[in-house]
């Protein structure tokens, strides 16, 4: 068991188009942060939030991902295949890895919803 | 298989900077799941840590060793080095360098190279 | 900084003996403690790591115990090559600390 714990916003569900927060917060640790990997379900890395470097998007996400807020991820004009898992790497030292995860659902906007946003009372 | 080799000069005048090179190879410096660390043994006594780097340059040490340390990272050359300044008899010592490893919590030194001997003396 | 103490320093053993070699921690490191062994003029080598798992190539006669501050290294039937320094190593927190080390000698 390790000393820290990862914090995750869980289980989120978001609109198609819309935009969502994935968030992961370390704590109960001294361990020292030296970066955060975001990686979707196929495991392919989204980003890097390095201690030194900064923020690192990698190309194929960089039209729909936006660094933070803090050490979080906000995805972008959110499509259906966006559903499914995401993980958060904290990698610190002396403490190693730490792996948050987070489950998202894209919704479909329903002909209800849309119509009831323009519902005049 | 990876392995680390330690160089540099085995001969060093008090009060100048020790610089030593752990050269990496059969594996990447650069993965994101591991550091690399320093450590040194003076003769006939016990092991001091002495400090761990990550490789964008993130770098813990040792207090006991004030800031008389640096360690600097080379991810073209697969490299991570180790600059002692104003360095005494006491800094006499074999220094290895390690990664820290393998993936698990808190990980201990799982690769060590064979070590160097430094004498501090005029 | 966490203190860790071996003891004994030095033992004398014969072959085939069943040794223990004990290390104390001055305040809790719950199972982040690592074992090696060094032989004259080589580098250590890792034989345990979080109180009680083997690395990989390591003889089953080595063994780790203990969590909090006490931890014991066993070795269950002495062979030759196991003639050396061992050391234990907490991984808890920085500065990393090791112990003054366990010579195991022929008797």
């Known amino acids: 068991m390790m000393t820290g714990t990862i914090e995750t916003t869980g289980n989120i569900s978001a609109k198609k188009g819309g935009s969502v927060i994935l968030q992961c917060h370390l704590s109960s640790t001294m361990a020292q942060v030296t970066q955060v990997n975001w990686e979707q379900h196929d495991h392919s890395l989204l980003a890097i939030r390095n201690a030194e470097l900064g923020w690192h998007i990698y190309p194929a996400f960089k039209d729909r991902v936006a660094p933070g807020p803090g050490l979080g991820l906000t995805l972008q004009s959110l499509t259906m295949n966006d559903t499914g898992e995401y993980f958060c790497t904290y990698h610190t030292y002396p403490d190693g890895t730490y792996r948050g995860r987070i489950f998202l659902e894209v919704l479909e906007s329903s002909v209800a919803e849309h119509s009831a946003r323009f519902q005049i009372p | 298989q990876l392995q680390l080799q330690e160089s540099g000069p085995g001969l060093v005048k008090p009060a100048e900077t020790l610089s030593l090179t752990c050269t990496v190879s059969?594996?990447?410096?650069?993965?994101?799941?591991?550091?690399w660390t320093w450590i040194r043994q003076p003769p006939g006594k016990g092991l001091e840590w002495i400090g761990t780097v990550y490789y964008s340059g993130s770098t813990f040490h040792n207090p006991s060793l004030k800031s008389r340390v640096t360690i600097p990272v080379d991810t073209s050359k697969n490299q991570f080095s180790l600059k002692l300044s104003s360095v005494t008899a006491a800094d006499t010592a074999v220094y290895y360098c390690?990664?820290?490893?393998?993936?698990?919590?808190?990980?201990?030194?799982?690769?060590w190279g064979q070590g160097t001997l430094v004498t501090v003396s005029s | 900084d966490i203190q860790m103490t071996q003891s004994p320093s030095s033992l004398s053993a014969s072959v085939g003996d069943r040794v223990t070699i004990t290390c104390r921690a001055s305040?809790?490191?719950?199972?982040?403690l690592n074992w090696y062994q060094q032989k004259p003029g080589k580098a250590p080598k890792l034989l345990i790591y979080a109180a009680s798992s083997l690395q990989s190539g390591v003889p089953s006669r080595f063994s780790g115990s203990g969590s909090g501050t006490d931890f014991t290294l066993t070795i269950s039937s002495l062979q030759p090559e196991d003639f050396a320094t061992y050391y234990c190593q907490q991984s808890y927190s920085t500065p990393i600390t090791f112990g003054g080390g366990t010579k195991v000698e022929i008797k």
């Open positions: 305040q809790s490191i719950s199972s982040y």
């Open positions: 390690a990664r820290v490893g393998p993936d698990v919590s808190h990980p201990p030194f799982d690769y």
């Open positions: 059969g594996g990447s410096i650069s993965s994101y799941d591991h550091y």
